[in-house]
């Protein structure tokens, strides 16, 4: 298993924006 996993799921993909204090998270924006 990986030696380091901070964010699970989509948060782990966001290596460019792992800073969660931005409030951006990893939301998917959709038009309803």
């Amino acid at each position: 298993s990986p030696k380091m996993v901070q964010g699970s799921g989509c948060f782990g993909r966001k290596m460019d924006r792992i800073s969660s204090s931005s409030g951006l998270g990893c939301k998917v924006l959709r038009r309803h």
């Epitope: 298993s1 990986p2 030696k3 380091m4 996993v5 901070q6 964010g7 699970s8 799921g9 989509c10 948060f11 782990g12 993909r13 792992i18 800073s19 969660s20 204090s21 998270g25 990893c26 939301k27 998917v28 959709r30």
Partner: antibody, heavy 117, light 111 residues
């Protein structure tokens, strides 16, 4: 073996504050994020957000912004969840759980929070 | 939020038979060839237990009678042959986007 051990059940009055602890052992605590999950009395599971145990940065799901705070004491391998201004809707069981690449692999035993005047 | 609908809400399966639980997402949970869909088992008084990740990967220590399948929006958890100790509530969960969401659970009873 990997374990997350949480503090015991809490009984609070409306408007009070509760702070739940989650101590990790059996792995390098600062290498894995800690997520918090609420289980409602109806047994629904709600992801509250997570804290980066390396940087201390916290991310909160929209439903848990404002009165909820995640924090760390890395020297004690411990994460905390604080809930302020408690109300009846906060009743349930709170779990800390470790980040896995896809999911949430190790879970604490849960901490029951009861709010009653 | 990406709502996960589990069915059936409960089912009773005879010992040794197959249990199939469905989880349908409002929209796809795939990213770069991976499905960000996980399964958990919860017994009364215990925390959820991590069973399957990325739709079909068995977590370490989980018996091979558990299997997962699906992609996109439609996923299944299969248990075969069902054993007494499998009586529990099963939840699916997506981690493809924020907020992570769980299905409402399927309670499995062994006949």
């Amino acid at each position: 073996q990997i374990q997350l051990v949480q503090s015991g059940p809490e009984l609070r009055k409306p408007g009070e504050t509760v702070k739940i602890s989650c101590k990790g052992s059996g792995y390098t605590f600062t290498h894995y994020g800690i997520n918090w999950v609420k289980q409602t009395p109806r047994k629904d599971l709600k992801w509250m957000g997570w804290i980066n145990t390396h940087t201390g940065e916290a991310y909160y799901a929209d439903d848990f912004k404002g009165r909820f705070a995640f924090s760390l004491e890395t020297s004690a391998n411990t994460a905390y969840l604080q809930i302020n201004n408690l109300n009846n809707g906060d009743m349930g069981t709170y779990f800390c759980t470790r980040s896995h690449r896809f999911g949430l692999d190790y879970w604490g035993q849960g901490t029951s929070v009861t709010v009653s005047s | 939020d990406n709502v996960l609908t589990q069915s059936p809400p409960s089912l009773a399966v005879s010992l040794g038979q197959r249990a199939t639980i469905s989880c349908k997402a409002n929209w796809p949970v795939d990213y770069n060839g991976d499905s960000y869909l996980n399964w958990y088992q919860q017994k009364p008084g215990q925390p959820p237990k991590f069973l399957i990740y990325a739709a079909s990967n068995l977590e370490s220590g989980i018996p091979a009678r558990f299997s997962g399948s699906g992609s996109g929006t439609d996923f299944n958890l299969n248990i075969h042959p069902v054993e007494e100790e499998d009586a529990a509530t099963y939840y699916c969960q997506q981690s493809n986007e924020d907020p992570f969401t769980f299905g409402s659970g399927t309670k499995l009873e062994i006949k």
